[in-house]
């Protein structure tokens, strides 16, 4: 049994780190493998993560962790029974992938404006809470040529779009993702998308 692609891990800077790797051949990850992890810290103990399959040769493990601080460093050992397949380390603060924003809602009852709101995925006491900026992707299933990214660089998780900039009488979808500039993170996954129908019509005298 061999590791083809070494584990690569990212932290959500809250309570979960996700490690993914590829094996040399088809593997029943949960039955054959264990990822052991331990914080480099006085009197810490070893904890075990049972991986799941992620495609034929891919495995993924969700490591339960404490709140992340910059000093934290973990040792990682990938075992197949009594055989040590790989040994490494992981510093969560240096490999952050934020959680995806949630509760994306479209408000169309605001005059002349489409208002999109979503929730910050972190509690106020988390360091990432006040550092997130967002990208909102809006596209149309009726008009495949239409896809826009709106960068939200302010803290408030809202975006206002003049309804007149969208075509009337067709449906649109939106999704949002986040990143934290000062923590040099990657982008989060996209939130689930939300659909709405743009029924806005310009006043007669403006047509």
């Amino acid at each position: 049994m061999k590791v083809l692609q070494e584990p690569a891990c990212v932290s959500d800077y809250m309570s979960i780190s996700t490690c993914e790797w590829k094996m040399g051949g088809p593997t029943n990850c949960s039955a054959e493998l264990r990822l052991l992890y331990q914080l480099v810290f006085q009197s810490s103990e070893t904890h075990t993560c049972v991986p799941e399959n992620n495609g034929g040769v891919g495995c993924v493990c969700h490591l339960l962790m404490d709140d992340v601080v910059s000093m934290d460093n973990y040792t990682l050992d990938l075992w197949a029974g009594q055989q040590l397949l790989w040994k490494g380390s992981f510093k969560p603060s240096e490999h952050v992938k934020p959680r995806a924003p949630g509760n994306l809602t479209v408000h169309t009852n605001v005059s002349d404006t489409v208002l999109l709101t979503w929730s910050n995925p972190y509690p106020p006491d988390n360091y990432l809470y006040n550092d997130l900026t967002y990208a909102v992707n809006i596209w149309s299933e009726n008009d495949p040529a239409y896809s826009r990214i709106h960068n939200v660089t302010y803290l408030k998780p809202t975006l206002r779009i003049p309804a007149s900039t969208l075509k009337s009488g067709i449906s649109y979808r939106a999704r949002v993702r986040a990143w934290a500039q000062h923590y040099n993170t990657t982008w989060s996954e996209w939130s689930p998308s939300t659909k709405w129908y743009n029924s806005y019509r310009e006043p007669f005298e403006q047509r």
């Epitope: 914080l39 810290f41 006085q42 009197s43 810490s44 103990e45 070893t46 904890h47 339960l64 962790m65 404490d66 601080v69 910059s70 000093m71 934290d72």
Partner: antibody, heavy 125, light 112 residues
Amino acid sequence: EVQLVESGGGLEQPGGSLRLSCAGSGFTFRDFAMTWVRQAPGKGLEWVSSISGDGSNTYYADSVKGRFTISRDNSKNTLYLQMNSLRAEDTAVYYCAKDRLSKTIRPRYYGLDVWGQGTTVTVSS
Amino acid sequence: DIVMTQSPLSLPVTPGEPASISCRSSQSLLYSIGYNYVDWYLQKSGQSPQLLIYLGNKRASGVPDRFSGSGSGTDFTLKISRVEAEDVGFYYCMQALGSPYTFGQGTKLEIK
């Protein structure tokens, strides 16, 4: 009531051995790291050794490394310190103390918040 | 190893007056914001040490509020707002960031 009771001290000749015990009660013993601290006559406190809650990690002062062994039996709620190749400078009162909660991912520290009454070890010919 | 240096080593105090003991570490004991791994212990004559303050400023259970800890990084202070006769004994700071744990030399507090 959370309590630690040491035993096993006594008079031993240089080069001899002693095994100290520390019985814990009133708390979930296996969840906590444990520590031994000693105090030579008229001197200050000196850390000797520590062990994680599951016994997988042990730590020693340079002055006792290779001679002392810390261990625990969680089924008996008891901590041990096996002392071999004893020297005159090991003469001290030995205290066991309850250390950090080590079963969490990052051990939670609340200080050495419970201490035993101490057991006296005298090494002399 | 981290060296802990206490001062003063002897502290005569009048009852009702405040007292202050300083402890300096040879390297930072700050692991993360608000978590300085330094404790303060009191050892009264013929007794086992007892915990007063942990993580720099957190008062242990049952410790009177006249005891307080402060400081961050390498400089720490134990303050007693109004010394009482029962406070006499040796006070030790200890770093618990990692092994080997190290203690200060001890400060003997006595009543004038």
